[in-house]
Interface confidence: low
Amino acid sequence: GVSFFFLSFHISNLQFNSSLEDPSTDYYQELQRDISEMFLQIYKQGGFLGLSNIKFRPGSVVVQLTLAFREGTINVHDVETQFNQYKTEAASRYNLTISDVSVSDVPFPFSAQS
């Protein structure tokens, strides 16, 4: 089976603008690509299956997304711990200042995104 986790965090050194509401814009696509790449770096273990439903909200930039793992390979605490451990690396590698990290279980992957 598959376990899903809903993750939300702030990128405090980026500014939200209307182009982050439109997936066709360069800014949206670049930020989406860089965040996807970052998560592949963070969760390198075999259980990570990928992420989906990236959304951007105002508040500098608030990022919301769903992470998928093989069932039983990771729990909420470990998802949050690994992400928090990566924050300084995110600053250096991706020029992202991350704060206000929140992780929760998602019983059905996309219900939390509606």
Epitope: L14, E30, S92
Partner: antibody, heavy 123, light 111 residues
């Protein structure tokens, strides 16, 4: 003062392994990546890979994957690069370098380098 | 892999002249507005020395005659007035994608 001090020159036979050390001082060792770069005689610079000492996370250049291993000893602030199955083309100067930030923490680059370790592979 | 191409291979100038070194990436090295390109100077028998980071930021202690410019794929290192001690090989490095890659280098000589 940030310093990276590498071990001395090595002469090895083809097929052997070599282990080069890089001792760091003058900064917080754990949160900074250490890069490994080599330079063959008269040639340019080639990135081999990196290790983050605090977690042991590594990234390798695919060209060297399977032949190179990076390890870190946080008790002595030392990083090691071991290259196996040596061939004559591995004759080079091997550098370790810190991927560090400026005083404001705003920018990152490979800023401090070791003095280099010459590895000669010859039968 | 991102291929970094430097030109010219050799630059021979008189003291006081302006040196312009080029580095071209095979794909963009920009990430969220930051260009992950760095310039190094290497003199014979020495380790490389960081001159410019993130395309245009002068490393502490480096003379102001060195400057960097460019974005995404095309970058330039400029030495505004060449000094004899600037004789060296200059390398660009991209840290945007693993494996990190260096350009082949530009050798700067004094005429």
């Amino acid at each position: 003062e940030v310093q990276l001090v590498q071990s001395g020159a090595e002469v090895k036979k083809p097929g052997a392994s070599v282990k080069v050390s890089c001792k760091a001082s003058g900064y917080r060792f754990i949160p900074y990546w250490i890069e490994w770069v080599r330079q063959a005689p008269g040639q340019g610079l080639e990135w081999m890979g990196e290790i983050l000492p605090g977690t042991g996370r590594t990234n390798y250049n695919e060209k060297f994957k399977g032949r190179v291993t990076f390890t870190a000893d946080t008790s002595t602030n030392t990083v090691y690069m071991e290259l196996s199955s040596l061939r004559s083309e591995d004759t080079a100067v091997y550098y370790c370098a810190r991927y560090g930030d400026d005083t404001s923490g705003g920018y990152y680059a490979v800023d401090y380098w070791g003095q280099g370790t010459t590895v000669t592979v010859s039968s | 892999d991102i291929v970094m191409t430097q030109s010219p291979a050799t630059l021979s100038l008189s003291p006081g002249e302006r040196a312009t070194l080029s580095c071209r990436a095979s794909e963009s090295v920009n990430i969220l507005g930051t260009n992950l390109i760095h310039w190094y100077q290497q003199k014979p028998g020495q380790a490389p020395k960081l001159l410019i980071y993130h395309a245009s930021n002068l490393e502490t202690g480096i003379p102001a005659r060195f400057s960097g410019s460019g974005s995404r794929t095309d970058f330039t290192l400029t030495i505004s007035s060449l000094e004899p001690e600037d004789v060296a090989v200059y390398y660009c490095l991209q840290s945007r994608k693993i494996p990190w890659t260096f350009g082949g280098g530009t050798k700067v000589e004094i005429k």
